[in-house]
């Protein structure tokens, strides 16, 4: 027989020879990192037909890493269900806790001993420092020094000293989230006031008012013979500008070759157009549009 078979988990006892006589026996033992469990044979014999009798390394079992308990407020999950070297142990924390350390440990062989690649991690309670204080506003629980996971605070704006109120820009309620950080940035309290939206050859159909503060929404439609260029709905945004910009009503072309665009505002068109000053929400002639901006 030629050289006997080689195995992942088993090694030949003694030095191999290039050739073996019929009837000659070779013995194996489990390699480092493995241990033998009976009853499978760990030897083979050179048979009369010059082949080795069947032998396997299935009796050699991998050494195992020490048991690791679930971390307090968390869980250790064996990726492949065993502690043998080559195993992976995954760690997760319960909701409201975060992991300190490595989230995966590997069972590794150090000479004959199976050991973990590091120390098991810890699961610590998620805590947040107090949320930011804001100018012209305040939040609830301002006296609390440490916030736990999912604890929430609500912001509100102070009364404004002038005629226009402070608007709260951003999320009014924020909570202590996963990475010990607040779910959103702190909001802002400031006066937001948009210019009066004038659309010539058109009219407002909703959102009437004299003053337009944060998130005020106005809708328009064009007079008959005009089409809307832009959006029929605009919103007063935090930088005191309309978004999208105030639309325009453009005259429909009467050229037979061009098809006029349809207005984005639907519904019947008025046959009679009253003077601008009679439209609800428009300033009276003595008020003037510019005078209305910054009072």
């Amino acid at each position: 027989c030629e050289a006997p078979p080689t195995f992942e988990a088993m090694e030949l006892i003694g030095k191999p020879k290039p050739y073996y006589r019929v009837g000659e026996r070779v013995d194996y033992k489990c390699k480092k990192g493995y241990f033998y469990i009976p009853p499978l044979a760990t030897h083979t014999i050179c048979d009369r037909n010059h082949t080795w009798l069947p032998v396997s390394d299935e009796g050699c079992y991998r050494e195992m890493c020490p048991h690791i308990r679930d971390p307090l407020n968390g869980e250790a999950i064996l990726a492949n269900g065993s502690y043998e070297f080559g195993a992976e142990l995954h760690f997760i924390c319960n909701e409201g806790y975060y992991l300190i350390g490595k989230d995966i440990l590997y069972c590794e062989l150090k000479d004959t001993v199976a050991i973990w690649s590091g120390k098991p991690p810890l699961c610590e309670k998620i805590l947040c420092t107090p949320p930011p204080k804001i100018k012209n506003g305040k939040h609830t629980f301002s006296e609390v020094e440490v916030f736990e996971y999912l604890d929430a605070v609500t912001y509100s704006c102070d009364p404004a000293p002038g005629p226009d109120p402070f608007s709260l820009i951003g999320e009014s309620m924020i909570y202590c989230g996963n990475n010990s950080t607040w779910s959103h940035a702190a909001p802002e309290c400031k006066v937001v006031k948009c210019r009066f939206p004038v659309v010539e050859n058109g009219k407002q159909i909703s959102g009437f008012g004299k003053k337009f503060y944060y998130k005020a929404t106005v809708m328009f439609e064009c007079d008959k013979g005009y089409y809307l260029n832009g959006s029929d709905k605009i919103v007063c945004e935090s930088n005191s500008t309309w978004d999208p910009p105030v639309p325009k009503c453009l005259k429909v072309s009467t050229s037979p070759t061009t098809k006029s665009p349809t207005s984005s505002a639907s519904g019947p068109r008025p046959t009679y157009k009253p003077p601008v000053s009679n439209y609800p929400g428009y300033p009276k002639p003595d008020e003037g549009i510019l005078n209305n901006l910054d009072d």
Partner: antibody, heavy 120, light 109 residues
Amino acid sequence: QVQLVESGGGVVQPGRSLRLSCAASGFTFSTYGMHWVRQAPGKGLEWLSFISYDGDEKYYADSVKGRFTISRDNSKNTLYLQMNSLRAEDTAVYWCAKASGYGMGILDYWGQGTLVTVSS
Amino acid sequence: SSELTQDPAVSVALGQTVRITCQGDSLRSYYVSWFQQKPGQAPVFVMYGQNNRPSGISERFSGSSSGNTASLIITGAQAEDEADYYCHSRDSSGTHLRVFGGGTKLTVL
């Protein structure tokens, strides 16, 4: 045929020392881990210590840690247990046992045991 | 260190089946070895895990495992099976230490 023969047991006073030996034959001693186990009279088995094939890895039960030392001499095919600061509760039959691999494995062969009596 | 718990004594009628159990946290993760010890003799390795017997150990001996409990089952118990039986496994405290159960005295009636 695997054979393990313990020696060195006897009567010893509390606080004194004793060294047990385990002579191995019938297998390649230098490629197997070894264990010591004891049994107090009328009690169960107690695992004490392990040493890897080359002596690099050693482990001890809490009850003997700091007092007992395991060692081996592969050139003499012999395992040792040095027992210091002996107490009455160390009175037991002591066995050496062969591991089934280079490491801790399972305890597949045992010696016949040696009796240690700690008494004043 | 953690413990493996065994019933102190179990009896079985000759020819009947008996189950010797061993409980412990470590058994959720590791197999158990079983040893038979007769009075005045050294322990003898009889079983590892579910059904790994050394040559010379009767096929009457088998093993099973579920959760944190391992069992040594003797089918058709004989008078020569009367002995103390010990389970042996890893310590569950995160070390490489080994631990034995307290032992079960099997009486064959």
